[in-house]
């Protein structure tokens, strides 16, 4: 989801944005800070064992609108929040996993053949 009522149309920022990165630091990052023309993000998702994993970093302007939209993916619990209002704004993002639905138990990946 977008924070602070931002419009969903991606527009070029006049200046580079610095974001905290964790588990998602590109080669050009320094001291766990990455740079982008798009958004900072923080994401929580379940790994293969069902453990929640938090990652954060930079999303380039290209394609970031789609990535920040947080469209539900079948059989995957994941939530992402994006921001641009200040440098390292994603330090203050705390997305939570969507609640388990009944069918996630019955129809989860473990039961697929």
């Amino acid at each position: 989801k977008k924070e602070d009522g931002e419009s969903t149309a991606p527009t070029a920022r006049p200046k580079v944005l610095r974001c905290k990165c964790h588990h998602h630091c590109p080669e050009d990052s320094v001291n766990n800070i990455c740079s982008t023309d798009g958004y900072c993000f923080t994401m929580i998702e379940e790994d293969d064992s069902g453990t929640p994993v938090v990652t954060s970093g930079c999303l380039g302007l290209e394609g970031s609108d789609f990535q920040c939209r947080d469209t539900p993916i079948p059989h995957q619990r994941r939530s992402i929040e994006c921001c641009t209002e200040r440098n390292e704004c994603n330090k203050d993002l705390h997305p939570t996993l969507p609640p388990l639905k009944d069918r996630d138990f019955v129809d989860g990946p473990i039961h697929h053949k």
């Epitope: 200046k15 580079v16 050009d28 990455c34 740079s35 982008t36 023309d37 930079c58 380039g60």
Partner: antibody, heavy 116, light 112 residues
């Protein structure tokens, strides 16, 4: 038009500190980073660091950490760089420069002379 | 830090000649966003640098079309198709992909 005004020269004694100024006009001050660059006579350009006036977020070249401190006064659209414990090695021209994804406008530079 | 190596250090030319300056970086300047933040500046004696080319090949406003930039990855070139008297000075390449940002040592364009 974009302008970055810097004093022409400063003379200070070794061991002292100095605060160099850079007054911006012709654009929205908080929409761009302000960088500072050092140039010694006959030598190349060295990036000192940068500050985002909108949130006062700074990034420094490790080489200048402890030597340079970057600050801004958004009410007067002025950026400052404080240099401490000055030695002859700090004698140079210091430029401020507007930065978005690249530097597009530079100040005229302040010539700093450290001499007793 | 990324080292920017410029060649030649000095470039004597006749007015009207073509001039070519090379800039090589010690690592790729392709940013994680896909942009390449390699830029060219001209500094005339006693003045501050002026932006000529940004992001490899984009001419800054007011820069004559005799200036062109090209290259990718670690290897970049600035070309001046027909050198004029006002083009004389020191040319610097600069990268803003990796912190700390770094500059080439400069190429002095002078009259032969």
């Amino acid at each position: 038009q974009v302008q970055l005004q810097q004093p022409g020269a400063e003379v200070v004694k070794p061991g002292a500190s100095v605060k160099l100024s850079c007054k911006a006009s012709g654009y929205t001050f908080t929409n761009y980073w302000m960088q500072w660059v050092k140039q010694r006579p006959g030598q190349g350009l060295e990036w000192i660091g940068e500050i985002d006036p909108s949130d006062r977020y700074t990034m420094y070249n490790q080489k200048f950490k402890g030597k340079a401190t970057l600050i801004v006064d958004t009410s007067s659209s002025t950026a400052y760089m404080q240099l401490s414990s000055l030695t002859s090695e700090d004698s140079a021209v210091y430029f401020c420069a507007r930065f978005g994804y690249y530097v597009d406008y530079w100040g005229q530079g302040t010539t700093l002379t450290v001499s007793s | 830090d990324v080292v920017m190596t410029q060649t030649p250090l000095s470039l004597p030319v006749s007015l009207g000649d073509q001039a070519s300056i090379s800039c090589r970086s010690s690592q790729s300047l392709v940013h994680s966003t896909g942009n390449t933040y390699l830029h060219w500046y001209l500094q005339k004696p006693g003045q501050s640098p002026n932006l000529l080319i940004y992001k490899v090949s984009n001419r800054f406003s007011g820069v004559p079309d005799r200036f062109s930039g090209s290259g990718s990855g670690t290897d970049f070139t600035l070309k001046i198709s027909r050198v004029e008297a006002e083009d004389l000075g020191v040319y610097f390449c600069s990268q803003s992909t990796h912190v700390p940002f770094t500059f080439g040592s400069g190429t002095k364009l002078e009259i032969k």
